[in-house]
């Protein structure tokens, strides 16, 4: 039985050209996290595997950095980065948990700076 829950940063905003940390946290389960996949809509961004460490998709290597922790840092943001991001936690023995984050990249300095995981 899957008892865990994924907490995410929810809906966040950031300024064009800036950086943002995407963060998810799995709680309420003793399941072992074997791998976390990060996806942007229909693109695999990165994978963090308990044994193999991080793999960043080559097409995102210049703008995606691993961490902190199981999170993902997006750099040099563009308006095209606006959209849904998913953290997919592969666990044993529970199975798969998925969290969703919506990022809005704003043209000007109207981005909110109160987001808990945002880089100033």
């Amino acid at each position: 039985m899957m008892t865990g829950t994924i907490e995410t940063t929810g809906n966040i905003s950031a300024e064009k050209g800036g950086s943002i940390i995407l963060q998810c946290h799995l709680s309420s389960t003793t399941a072992q996290v074997t791998q976390v996949n990060w996806e942007q809509q229909d693109q695999l961004l990165a994978i963090c595997n308990a044994d193999l460490g991080w793999h960043i998709s080559p097409s995102f290597k210049d703008r995606v950095a691993p961490g902190p922790g199981l999170g993902l840092t997006l750099q040099s943001l563009t308006v095209n980065d606006t959209g849904e991001y998913f953290c997919i936690y592969h666990t044993y023995p529970d199975g798969t948990y998925t969290g969703r984050i919506f990022l809005e990249v704003l043209e000007s300095s109207v981005a909110e700076h109160g987001a808990r995981f945002q880089i100033p």
Partner: antibody, heavy 118, light 107 residues
Framework: EVQLLESGGGLVQPGGSLRLSCAAS????????MHWVRQAPGKGLEWVAG????????SYADSVKGRFTISRDNSKNTLYLQMNSLRAEDTAVYYC???????????WGQGTLVTVSS | DIQMTQSPSSLSASVGDRVTITCRAS??????LNWYQQKPGKAPKLLIY???SLQSGVPSRFSGSGSGTDFTLTISSLQPEDFATYYC?????????FGGGTKVEIK
């Protein structure tokens, strides 16, 4: 250098059993998911079974579920496929493959031929 | 199960030609799509993983694109050693499934 070497294939009668082995070298075997893929003569590729790095999670194609068992011995750097209740349609070359991150098969063995015939 | 449909099943081309092979999934698989090359009597070889990432050591004339349900493998300028059978494979969910293959033959 990464190497995967399958063995254990051969001729077996319908209803019989075989155990295939895949000896791995050149990488940290315990860190990788490993899969078996087969190819019937003149046909395409068919995934058979997979086992994740810890060995706790396994998965099978419907066509072999309940008859085949995938396992691994990380201390011996070896992957296994126990095949029971073999049928003529199981005749194929069986390949083992390394699967980093459970997503792509980056190294394959040379294959071992299993022939099920009376 | 996710079905993978490859087209064409075979094609004839000449050295230097641009060759395109397509693969369609029966449901969205994000970018969990890999391409393999197989020559007669040999094991498959990984060319492209995660839809568009070129495997180390594979010539840059091979490229992959697509996401969701529609994917493409392109060989920009066919070389003599590229005559082979090509397979797509989804790793979005088990059971993992392969396309039926595309045989690239010499015209």
């Amino acid at each position: 250098e990464v190497q995967l070497l399958e063995s254990g294939g051969g001729l077996v009668q319908p209803g019989g059993s075989l155990r295939l082995s895949c000896a791995a070298s050149g990488f940290t075997f315990s860190s990788y998911s490993m899969h078996w893929v087969r190819q019937a003569p003149g046909k395409g590729l068919e995934w058979v079974a997979g086992i994740w790095s810890s060995g706790g999670t396994t998965s099978y194609a419907d066509s072999v579920k309940g008859r085949f068992t995938i396992s691994r011995d990380n201390s011996k750097n070896t992957l296994y496929l126990q095949m029971n209740s073999l049928r003529a349609e199981d005749t194929a070359v069986y390949y083992c493959a390394r699967v980093p991150y459970g997503v792509w098969m980056d190294y394959w063995g040379q294959g071992t031929l299993v022939t099920v015939s009376s | 199960d996710i079905q993978m449909t490859q087209s064409p099943s075979s094609l004839s081309a000449s050295v230097g030609d641009r060759v395109t092979i397509t693969c369609r999934a029966s449901q969205s698989i994000s970018s969990y799509l890999n391409w393999y090359q197989q020559k007669p009597g040999k094991a498959p070889k990984l060319l492209i993983y995660a839809a568009s990432s070129l495997q180390s050591g594979v010539p840059s004339r091979f490229s992959g694109s697509g996401s969701g349900t529609d994917f493409t493998l392109t060989i920009s300028s066919l070389q003599p050693e590229d005559f082979a059978t090509y397979y797509c494979q989804q790793s979005y969910s088990t059971p993992l499934t392969f396309g039926g293959g595309t045989k690239v033959e010499i015209k």
